[in-house]
């Protein structure tokens, strides 16, 4: 990894605990201001592998609401608007970091947690293996 | 929102600061142990809207490495393996939380940051509007 020279103005929070506990400012800085506001807007409907979005809420997690994609079809939509079952609609998954209240119900104490979320769906061509 | 009864065993970190600063244990708990290990494995190659993955590294961010998807084609791959330019390969984007060292170069002090990442690509059929 890259070694970062320590800033002398850092808060004095010597690490007596293992696993390491750090201070985190929850006032979120949003770096998306210059990004295109449309984002994935209506892709869930217009994709050849469309998906539905399901709300997953957990008050013990931060963020408490996460949207999960579920592919609508087993196959993909063809040029005629029909489902082509020779293709597969599959979820694109991503590991994300969330904060889990630990101990439970504590407002100011969290643990980092990695969770896998489905962000949307894509259409894949399966590799066909002929069994002898 | 949902009101959570406070656990009496919570660390005593009364909120003198605004914006709110909390304690976070960086020993990551991975909840993905039971998930399918393949994930989006080779979807980036087999999708009808394939993508390349680009490494984005920033030592002042946690996680320091994030992979960004860039769609390979403007159009989508058709049944013959050719690019169909009547369709669009588009990135599926997601807002994720990361930790940004603040003040810079500090090992134990962070601020939550929201960034937009492209996770993969999907193929969309545009609605065609005829301009008068």
């Amino acid at each position: 990894g890259i070694t970062i020279p320590r800033n002398p103005g850092c808060p004095n929070s010597e690490d007596k605990n293992f696993p390491r506990t750090v201070m985190v400012n929850l006032n979120i800085h949003n770096r998306n201001t210059n990004t295109n506001p449309k984002r994935s807007s209506d892709y869930y409907n217009r994709s050849t592998s469309p998906w539905n979005l399901h709300r997953n809420e957990d008050p013990e997690r931060y963020p408490s609401v996460i949207w999960e994609a579920k592919c609508r079809h087993l196959g993909c939509i063809n040029a005629d608007g029909n489902v082509d079952y020779h293709m597969n609609s599959v979820p694109i998954q991503q590991e994300i970091l969330v904060l889990r209240r630990e101990p439970p119900h504590c407002p100011n104490s969290f643990r980092l947690e990695k969770i896998l979320v489905s962000v949307g769906c894509t259409c894949v061509t399966p590799i066909v293996h002929h069994v002898a | 929102g949902i009101t959570i009864p406070r656990n009496p065993g919570c660390p005593n970190s009364e909120d003198k600061n605004f914006p709110r600063t909390v304690m976070v244990n960086l020993n990551i708990h991975n909840r993905n142990t039971n998930t399918n290990p393949k994930r989006s494995s080779d979807y980036y190659n087999r999708s009808t809207s394939p993508w390349n993955l680009h490494r984005n590294e920033d030592p002042e961010r946690y996680p320091s490495v994030i992979w960004e998807a860039k769609c390979r084609h403007l159009g989508c791959i058709n049944a013959d393996g050719n690019v169909d330019y009547h369709m669009n390969s588009v990135p599926i984007q997601q807002e994720i939380l990361v930790l940004r060292r603040e003040p810079p170069h500090c090992p134990n002090s962070f601020r939550l940051e929201k960034i937009l990442v492209s996770v993969g690509c999907t193929c969309v059929t545009p609605i065609v509007h005829h301009v008068a």
């Epitope: 295109n36 506001p37 449309k38 | 669009n88 588009v90 969309v124 545009p126 065609v128 509007h129």
Partner: nanobody, 118 residues
């Protein structure tokens, strides 16, 4: 509402050149890509060339590669199609298209006639 202003086509001799332009305007929209399509009598509309707005990458149909060049002026939401070494089989109505809304909506121009005589 998106408007498209396409330049006039014309009649050219085989081996000659022609430049088409197309400007997108109207309201606030974010361009995803711009393309040229063409349709010859009795045939389906086919892709000619395209440009991705963010990356600036250009794409061409095999039939025009090396002869046609597409370029863009992003600030003006305008694209150009420089057509060289024209052939009679390039005769068609050429349509400009702009994709907005992240690629979910396509606005197709009225088209301009290009005729290549032998």
């Amino acid at each position: 509402e998106v408007q498209l202003v396409e330049s006039r086509g014309g009649l050219v001799q085989a081996g000659g050149s022609l430049r088409l332009s197309c400007a997108a305007s109207g309201g606030t929209f974010s361009v995803f890509a711009m393309r040229w399509f063409r349709q010859a009598p009795g045939k389906e509309r086919e892709f000619v060339a395209g440009i991705s707005w963010t990356g600036g990458t250009t794409y061409y149909a095999d039939s025009v590669k090396g002869r046609f060049t597409m370029s863009a002026d992003n600030a003006k939401n305008t694209v150009y199609l420089q057509m060289n070494s024209l052939k009679p089989e390039d005769t068609a109505v050429y349509y400009c298209a702009v994709d907005v809304g992240g690629g979910s909506d396509r606005y197709l121009g009225q088209g301009t006639q290009v005729t290549v005589s032998s």
